[in-house]
């Protein structure tokens, strides 16, 4: 989801934006700070063992609108928030995992009578 009440169409920024990065730092980052022409993000998702993992970093302008839209993915619990209002704005983003749906509890084989 987008913060800041931004419009959905991404517009080119006149200046670089610095973001905190964690588990998602590109080679050109320095001291866990990355640079982008797009958005800062923070994302929470479950790993294979069901443990929530928080990732943060930079999204380039190209394709970031789609990535920040947080469309639900079947069988995957994750949530992403994006921001641009100031440098390292993603330090203050705290996305939460969407609630488990009933079908998500069925994780064993299907038993037939």
């Amino acid at each position: 989801k987008k913060e800041d009440g931004e419009s959905t169409a991404p517009t080119a920024r006149p200046k670089v934006l610095r973001c905190k990065c964690h588990h998602h730092c590109p080679e050109d980052s320095v001291n866990n700070i990355c640079s982008t022409d797009g958005y800062c993000f923070t994302m929470i998702e479950e790993d294979d063992s069901g443990t929530p993992v928080v990732t943060s970093g930079c999204l380039g302008l190209e394709g970031s609108d789609f990535q920040c839209r947080d469309t639900p993915i079947p069988h995957q619990r994750r949530s992403i928030e994006c921001c641009t209002e100031r440098n390292e704005c993603n330090k203050d983003l705290h996305p939460t995992l969407p609630p488990l749906k009933d079908r998500d509890f069925v994780d064993g084989p299907i038993h037939h009578k």
């Epitope: 006149p14 200046k15 670089v16 610095r18 590109p26 080679e27 050109d28 980052s29 320095v30 990355c34 640079s35 982008t36 022409d37 797009g38 930079c58 380039g60 302008l61 190209e62 100031r86 440098n87 390292e88």
Partner: antibody, heavy 116, light 112 residues
Framework: QVQLQQPGAEVVRPGASLKLSCKAS????????MQWIKQRPGQGLEWIGE????????MYNQKFKGKATLTVDTSSSTAYMQLSSLTSEDSAVYFC?????????WGQGTTLTVSS | DVVMTQTPLSLPVSLGDQASISCRSS???????????LHWYLQKPGQSPNLLIY???NRFSGVPDRFSGSGSGTDFTLKISRVEAEDLGVYFC?????????FGSGTKLEIK
């Protein structure tokens, strides 16, 4: 048109501190970063650091941490660089420069002479 | 820090000649956004540098079309198709992909 005005020259004693200024006009001050760059004869150009006037966020070249401190006054669209504990090594021309994703406009530079 | 190596250090030319300046970086300048932040500046004696080319090959406003930039990754070139008297000075390449940003040592374009 974009203009970055800097004082032409400053002379200070070794050990002193000095605050250099850079007054911006012709654009929205908070829409671009302001960078500071050092040039010594025969030593080329060195990037000191940058400040985003919209939130006072700074990034420094490790080499100049403790030597340079960058600030801005958005009410007057002026950027400042404080240089401390000056030595002859700090004698140079100091440029301020507007930065978006690259430097597109430079100030005329302030020639700093550190001499007793 | 990324080292920017410019060659030659001095380039004597005759007016009307083509001039070519090379700039090599110690690391790739392709940013994680996909952009390549390599730029060229001209500094005339007693003046501040002026932007000529940004992001490898884009001419800045007001820059004559005799100036062109090319290259990718770590290897970049500035070409002046027909040198004019006003083109004389020191040319610098610069990268703003990696912090700290760095500059080449300069190429002095002078009359042969």
């Amino acid at each position: 048109q974009v203009q970055l005005q800097q004082p032409g020259a400053e002379v200070v004693r070794p050990g002193a501190s000095l605050k250099l200024s850079c007054k911006a006009s012709g654009y929205t001050f908070t829409s671009y970063w302001m960078q500071w760059i050092k040039q010594r004869p025969g030593q080329g150009l060195e990037w000191i650091g940058e400040i985003d006037p919209s939130d006072n966020y700074t990034m420094y070249n490790q080499k100049f941490k403790g030597k340079a401190t960058l600030t801005v006054d958005t009410s007057s669209s002026t950027a400042y660089m404080q240089l401390s504990s000056l030595t002859s090594e700090d004698s140079a021309v100091y440029f301020c420069a507007r930065f978006g994703f690259y430097v597109d406009y430079w100030g005329q530079g302030t020639t700093l002479t550190v001499s007793s | 820090d990324v080292v920017m190596t410019q060659t030659p250090l001095s380039l004597p030319v005759s007016l009307g000649d083509q001039a070519s300046i090379s700039c090599r970086s110690s690391q790739s300048l392709v940013h994680s956004t996909g952009n390549t932040y390599l730029h060229w500046y001209l500094q005339k004696p007693g003046q501040s540098p002026n932007l000529l080319i940004y992001k490898v090959s884009n001419r800045f406003s007001g820059v004559p079309d005799r100036f062109s930039g090319s290259g990718s990754g770590t290897d970049f070139t500035l070409k002046i198709s027909r040198v004019e008297a006003e083109d004389l000075g020191v040319y610098f390449c610069s990268q703003s992909t990696h912090v700290p940003f760095t500059f080449g040592s300069g190429t002095k374009l002078e009359i042969k």
